[in-house]
Interface confidence: low
Amino acid sequence: EVEKTACPSGKKAREIDESLIFYKKWELEACVDAALLATQMDRVNAIPFTYEQLDVLKHKLDELYPQGYPESVIQHLGYLFLKMSPEDIRKWNVTSLETLKALLEVNKGHEMSPQVATLIDRFVKGRGQLDKDTLDTLTAFYPGYLCSLSPEELSSVPPSSIWAVRPQDLDTCDPRQLDVLYPKARLAFQNMNGSEYFVKIQSFLGGAPTEDLKALSQQNVSMDLATFMKLRTDAVLPLTVAEVQKLLGPHVEGLKAEERHRPVRDWILRQRQDDLDTLGLGLQGGIPNGYLVLDLSMQEALS
């Protein structure tokens, strides 16, 4: 808190300019009019104020706008945004994507701070859904943004927004998130031809069910092992050796290196050893010849 003192003669700020960097904190408090500051916020960013001086400027704006800053001020906060607390930001009503971009730019290159998380939350809630332009902006600044959302939050993402998602945006998503995103991606890309469709859908396949994987195996897609290893185990288990061979194409040889890891390990245990031997990869652990395989899940469904 800065003490209230009279402004020294001749020091009253007529405009926000670089001469203010030499004002002591109490002089800034006494000599800079809050309304002038609010109308010339765009200049603050071009002036090398210290963090202590920025504290004083923030204090002045807080006094002028106790209910929260108007968007005209927020858009030009620049580095003063780093001084805001999540509590400050919860008072704001940010509706313009340009404002959001301007503030994200300030935090660029840093981890998502609580301030930024609060800002994004306020913005998205204000819009009602994660539209394509917003998602485009957020993933450009924070590639991991999508995977930081809960499955419930992801359910508000319209399929049209999926076009903005890049493979790296999904790197940290878990299966529950991909379960939500995959059907949206399938819908978004449904009118593309086979090879183009696979390129787009590939990153989302961690949420694909068995029947979709079977369908893909008929389309010569040559899925790489990295993608295969991210598939849902329960979706892979019912695939036959022939289907996996078709799905992976020339990459099928990579199964040997992954035979101890899920989902490959669990899939091997479900296959007849005879069938595995047809791959010529030396995969071991399949069901020995002559053993009868009972599908208990089918039996339960019938009884």
């Epitope: 300019d17 670089e18 001469s19 960097i21 030499f22 071009a46 090398p48 210290t50 963090y51």
Partner: nanobody, 124 residues
Framework: EVQLVESGGGLVQPGGSLRLSCAAS????????MGWFRQAPGKGRELVAG????????YYPDSVEGRFTISRDNAKRMVYLQMNSLRAEDTAVYYC?????????????????WGQGTQVTVSS
């Protein structure tokens, strides 16, 4: 980035004058606010004069107000510190420093670029 080299220091009697110069190379000087600091033995650095990038605003602490004058010539890429009525307590190494116009990331080092310093000794 800007490189700074100070000159003009030396031995002067109390009451005497000295003019320090700071030559800048690298970036355009007009994009930097400039300051003169001093550091006496066993003490921290203190800002004794500051000037805005255009030269329109200056700052002096009470200890040198009226005795020291900072000026700049952006075309010649020079900054000057005219020191009059020198006292024994003005003895120190004097540094020229620059701070970029734009946001300050680090609250502890407002000035980004420093010269090597020039010794000023006031003694009879």
């Amino acid at each position: 980035e800007v490189q700074l080299v100070e000159s003009g220091g030396g031995l002067v009697q109390p009451g005497g004058s000295l003019r320090l110069s700071c030559a800048a190379s690298g970036d355009t000087l007009s994009t930097y606010a400039m300051g003169w600091f001093r550091q006496a033995p066993g003490k921290g650095r203190e800002l004794v004069a500051g000037i805005t990038s255009s030269g329109s605003g200056t700052y002096y602490p009470d200890s040198v107000e009226g005795r020291f004058t900072i000026s700049r010539d952006n075309a010649k890429r020079m900054v000057y510190l005219q020191m009059n009525s020198l006292r024994a307590e003005d003895t120190a190494v004097y540094y020229c420093a620059a701070r970029r116009i734009g946001p300050v990331y680090d609250p502890y080092s407002v000035y980004n670029y420093w010269g090597q310093g020039t010794q000023v000794t006031v003694s009879s």
